[in-house]
């Protein structure tokens, strides 16, 4: 056959669905390689063609959209499944062509079986909540398009296996779920099951997210420098290993990248020629405000070493703070032998 | 220094509706989450209701749900408790209370006595 | 709703003794309990958060231990202005409940 742009397997796009529930799957042609839509591709009189290749298996087949009650149909660039089987995993194509013009994208499709309290191998999408805001909602996700907003559908939600009903401060609101006050005991996979009706059929849409309570904006500071502080001098021998740990606390800002660096003499240690080497080790509070250790390190420190300067610097969307480590040359214990003794007066 | 000084307490008759205030000072009253917690005489604490920072969380005991409303107001640091159709088993002191998800209750006013008798 | 559960009711203690008071909550509350001392006639005053954080201003003979659904406040050796009720809080769900109190009283 003529040459086709083949845009591979899109492994960008895995997608996930529960089994015996329906699912509609766009094309991703037109929503990520190429610059037209469906309906332009359509009336430039363009057919879409679906196959597929299951699971474990090299050969692509087409689609059998003869089955029993239209089980797989497809409706412009959707393909819809009322509802998924175990079976259909595999990998899909979607195809536009004409005489002239062919292009083709491939991308996974994995039907994954739940539980009864709706665990599964789904990889859920995480929803952040600020700790203690007034009022905040999610919404039940990925439901548009599954049936006409003339159908009213019946929401339930579940936290973790429990129906949410009665819950203090977790309201339960048509397609959203709304959380008052939010505590960190808020935190866990939340579930949404739709229930509509089709052609006579019951179908079930079950999404499950995860809420995860984070600091609020408005208790975020700068960062925090821990150390190094105007308390610990490093006092030390030439000889000896210089260790001094900077300790920043960022409060949890969404999005903000935490940075923190050590300076030698005003100079980055990547740029000096000193042997210095820096570990950095990261930990989070339960509501994901980090703390970062940057520990720096000079095996056998030198006299000059010890007369250098050495600042850790912090940043973060708050702000820029540094701070200088006292460091200084250890004076020797005086030998009595010799210093004292002369000090008395002994030859 | 942190104070909280409530008012608005007294003799009230059952049915009857009453007003309690709280006025704020010495810290940012827009930053923090307040509550009324009650006290019966001789009796233990019981949390009434909370309100986020922004007044547009609130969360009330079961005890008071569709009887009470908390409110504030942040241009006046002023917390507000709106108790409608009171029982005898409403009275109690009541004190406003600052907190902090991190450390609870941290300030504590002194405390308004309510009374629900005939 | 998280019962909290205080025990002993009453503690007869003499000044200079060591105090130890418990109180259970029905769930796990993690380290999301407060301790809160009251006199007669005053409002609650915070002493211990986050199960054994002291409050600012708290004399460092007042400790608390615990996480989960056990937890102990202890008092290292009771000084006079320390006879009071004692109330632990969970604010871990809400609603925010309250223990029902323990006396300490002078032996």
């Known amino acids: 056959s003529e040459r086709c742009d083949d845009w591979g397997l899109d492994t960008m796009r895995q997608i996930q669905v529960f089994e015996d529930e329906p699912a509609r799957i766009k094309c991703p042609l037109f929503e990520h390689f190429l610059k037209f839509n469906y309906s332009t591709a359509h009336s430039a009189g363009l057919t879409l063609i679906w196959y597929w290749t299951r699971q474990d298996r090299d050969l692509e087949e087409p689609i059998n959209f003869r089955l029993p009650e239209n089980r797989i149909s497809k409706e412009k660039d959707v393909l819809w499944f009322r509802p998924t089987l175990l079976n259909d995993t595999g990998n899909y194509t979607c195809m536009l062509r004409n005489t002239t013009y062919c292009s083709k994208v491939a991308f996974p499709l994995e039907v994954v079986q739940k539980d009864s309290c709706f665990n599964s191998p789904m990889k859920l999408p995480v929803h952040k909540l600020y700790i203690e805001y007034g009022i905040q909602r999610i919404t039940c996700p990925n439901v548009d398009g599954y049936f006409p907003s003339s159908v009213k559908p019946t929401i339930t939600w579940y936290m973790g296996c429990y129906k949410i009903q009665n819950f203090n401060n977790v309201i339960p609101e048509g397609m959203n779920l709304s959380f008052l006050i939010a505590l960190i005991s808020n935190n866990g996979n939340y579930t949404c099951v739709v229930t509509y009706p089709e052609n006579g059929r019951t179908f079930h849409l079950t999404r499950t997210l995860t809420v995860k309570v984070v600091g609020s904006p408005k208790n975020a500071v700068p960062p925090v420098i821990h150390s190094p502080n105007d308390h610990v001098v490093y006092e030390k021998e030439p000889g000896e290993e210089l260790l001094i740990p900077c300790t920043v606390y960022f409060s949890f800002l969404m999005d903000s990248r935490n940075e923190v660096w050590w300076t030698i003499d005003g100079k980055k240690p990547d740029d000096i020629t000193i042997d210095v080497t820096i570990n950095e080790s990261i930990s989070h509070s339960r509501t994901e405000d980090e703390t970062r250790t940057q520990i720096l390190s000079i095996k056998k420190v030198t006299s000059e070493d010890l007369k250098r300067s050495y600042v850790c610097h912090a940043r973060s969307a708050k702000g820029e703070v540094a701070k200088a480590a006292k460091v200084k040359q250890k004076v020797p214990a005086p030998r009595y032998t010799v210093e004292l003794a002369c000090g008395f007066g002994a030859t | 220094e942190v104070q909280l000084l409530e008012s608005g307490g007294g003799l009230v008759q059952p049915g009857g509706s009453l007003r309690l205030s709280c006025a704020a000072s010495?810290?940012?009253?827009?930053?923090?989450?307040m509550s009324w917690v009650r006290q019966a005489p001789g009796k233990g604490l019981e949390w009434v209701s909370a309100i986020s920072y922004d007044g547009e969380g609130t969360l009330y005991a079961d005890s008071v749900k569709g009887r009470f409303t908390i409110s504030r107001d942040n241009s006046k640091n002023t917390l507000y408790l709106q108790m409608n159709s009171l029982r005898a088993e409403d009275t109690a002191v009541y004190y406003c209370?600052?907190?902090?998800?991190?450390?609870?209750?941290?300030?504590w006013g002194q405390g308004t006595l309510v009374t629900v008798s005939s | 709703e998280i019962v909290m559960t205080q025990s002993p009711a009453t503690l007869s203690v003499s000044p200079g003794e060591r105090a130890t008071l418990s109180c259970r909550a029905s769930q796990s509350v993690s380290s999301n309990l407060a301790w809160y001392q009251q006199k007669p006639g005053q409002a609650p005053r915070l002493l211990i958060y986050?199960?054994?954080t002291r409050a600012t201003g708290i004399p460092a003979r007042f400790s608390g231990s615990g996480s989960g659904t056990e937890f102990t406040l202890t008092i290292s050796s009771l000084q006079s202005e320390d006879f009071a009720v004692y109330y632990c809080q969970q604010y871990n769900n809400w609603p925010w409940t309250f223990g029902q109190g323990t006396k300490v009283e002078i032996k």
């Open positions: 209370a600052r907190f902090r998800y991190y450390t609870a209750f941290d300030y």
């Open positions: 010495g810290f940012i009253f827009s930053h923090y989450g």
């Open positions: 986050g199960a054994s």
